[in-house]
Interface confidence: low
């Protein structure tokens, strides 16, 4: 079924704990129809987390993302536009475990949904986790994203709504630069090969899929140092009917926390959008084998080209998240 503007595509029950801003690529607000207001933060790994908009760190994160987006725009870069009510801002991203997140296909009007959900064990393998939401629902991009670091998504544990794998099964969006209005966003699935970094000077003013984030719970933007070894992000996908809740407890138990429901609309007829860099604080690598999907800015629903074998996609994602 096609969700209207008023339909709540992402539902948050638990809010993530603080996530390093550097791990975030963009954010967006959930719909007013969701009742409980929340900010959906997307990490470089394309993990989605529910955050409380009233918390100062969330406000700071959004502001940071906004600044980064503005800075990139000034530098000729581009960033991913926020979708719907989302406002570009940067906040610490929490690497989270993927628990219940439902992606509901809308294109066909079918109610079936793809719900990627990593086991808590897998989530634990990730460096840090927090509630994540299905990818493709956030709006602003933030810092530069790692190619596809599996382990650098630092974030709250157990609150991750849904982590989109860097593989082609993940979805991200491309959009015009922040100053370029555009109603629709292309969702670009990330391939196992994370998007490549682009030279700011070569980036176009278009959005590209966000790069994976670091999974270190406390890590922020790309920093250089020697310390933790990269840890893969683990997530499992499973097919389910109906929305899947996403966990939002960032640094808590790996158990499910807040759940986010994301509607995903398969759009097999969609053209393949060009992969363009997103400017938002950092340069986001482009996905190599993006799944082209479009997102209706009026809703958080993500339209993703149908995957032939959802389970296979899940398996790929799961595999990708393990070293």
């Amino acid at each position: 079924q096609h969700h209207g503007v008023t339909k709540c595509n992402i539902t948050c029950s638990k809010m993530t704990s603080k996530i390093p801003v550097a791990l975030l690529i963009h954010y967006q607000q959930n719909q007013a129809s969701c009742g409980k207001r929340a900010i959906i933060l997307e990490t470089r790994q394309h993990r989605l987390f529910c955050a409380d908009p009233k918390e100062q760190w969330v406000k700071d994160a959004m502001q940071h993302l906004d600044r980064q987006a503005a800075a990139l725009t000034r530098n000729g870069g581009t960033f991913e536009k926020q979708i719907g009510e989302v406002k570009p801002r940067t906040t610490p991203a929490a690497g989270g475990m993927d628990e219940s997140v439902v992606l509901e296909p809308e294109a066909t009007g079918e109610s079936s949904s793809l719900e990627p959900t990593p086991s808590s064990q897998e989530a634990q393998r990730a460096l840090g986790t927090s509630p994540e939401l299905p990818t493709g629902v956030t709006g602003s991009s933030g810092t530069r994203l790692p190619p596809t670091p599996k382990a650098q998504d630092g974030g709250p544990v157990g609150t991750e709504l849904f982590r989109v794998p860097p593989v082609s099964t993940a979805a991200t969006w491309q959009s015009s630069a922040p100053h370029q209005p555009g109603p629709s966003l292309w969702a670009e699935a990330k391939t196992s090969e994370a998007p490549s970094t682009q030279d700011p000077s070569t980036q176009a003013s278009t959005a590209s899929s966000p790069a994976p984030e670091e999974n270190a719970p406390s890590e922020g933007q790309r920093v250089w140092g020697q310390g933790q070894s990269p840890r893969p992000e683990n997530s499992l996908e499973r097919e389910e009917m109906g929305p899947v809740p996403a966990h939002t407890d960032a640094f808590q138990d790996w158990g499910p926390g807040s759940m986010a429901h994301v509607s995903v609309v398969p759009v097999s007829s969609e053209g393949t959008p060009s992969r363009e860099p997103v400017a938002s604080g950092s340069w986001t690598p482009k996905a190599e084998e993006p799944i082209h999907a479009t997102m209706d800015p009026q809703r958080l629903g993500v339209l993703i080209t149908p995957v032939p074998d959802a389970q296979a996609a899940t398996r790929r994602q799961h595999h990708h998240h393990h070293h």
Partner: antibody, heavy 117, light 107 residues
Framework: EVQLQQSGPELVKPGASVKISCKAS????????MNWVKQSHGKSLEWIGD????????SYNQKFKGKATLTVDKSSSTAYMELRSLTSEDSAVYYC??????????WGQGTTLTVSS | DIVMTQSHKFMSTSVGDRVSITCKAS??????VAWYQQKPGQSPKLLIY???TRHTGVPDRFTGSGSGTDYTLTISSVQAEDLALYYC?????????FGGGTKLEIK
Amino acid sequence: EVQLQQSGPELVKPGASVKISCKASGYTFTDYYMNWVKQSHGKSLEWIGDINPNQGGTSYNQKFKGKATLTVDKSSSTAYMELRSLTSEDSAVYYCASSGNSYVDYWGQGTTLTVSS
Amino acid sequence: DIVMTQSHKFMSTSVGDRVSITCKASQDVSTAVAWYQQKPGQSPKLLIYWASTRHTGVPDRFTGSGSGTDYTLTISSVQAEDLALYYCQQHYSSPYTFGGGTKLEIK
């Protein structure tokens, strides 16, 4: 254990080119950007650029465009930086450093490049 | 490019003392600041990122603070092994730039 093993010291003549290698181990090579940083003798650090091992996408510090070229060989988990048209100003210690974010998490031991006739 | 300025090239302190190393950015970097320690003959080592997040394995005597354009690395109780060069780096936007470094000397 994450390790970034760089090639040995280089002594080259002005005008020549040199290719420094950095072999990564202890983590999934394609999961992290590989950065290159220059440290001239007695001076600070300069970020040269980075490369996404997945597709080889690069981002350079404008100052080093035309001077440095970053590449990777995924099969061997090795990153390379080629420096061309060398001058004495290029004499320095060059570090490869992996990162998942905009700060570096792991550094190689450094490769000393000496440009002298 | 964003310029990171570490006003003190050298700082002399004694073991057990509290010392603060400062860094100023030419523009607001939204706490996207990292601190690295480089001991003689070694590669830099990440201490702090995102202004105040301590990297794994870094002793808790090292703390970072700051916002906007002003950032500080504080060593609450200096140890002999802390003798090193300390660099700040903005990881807010590319090209990522470093401060000139502050050499901490032990009296």
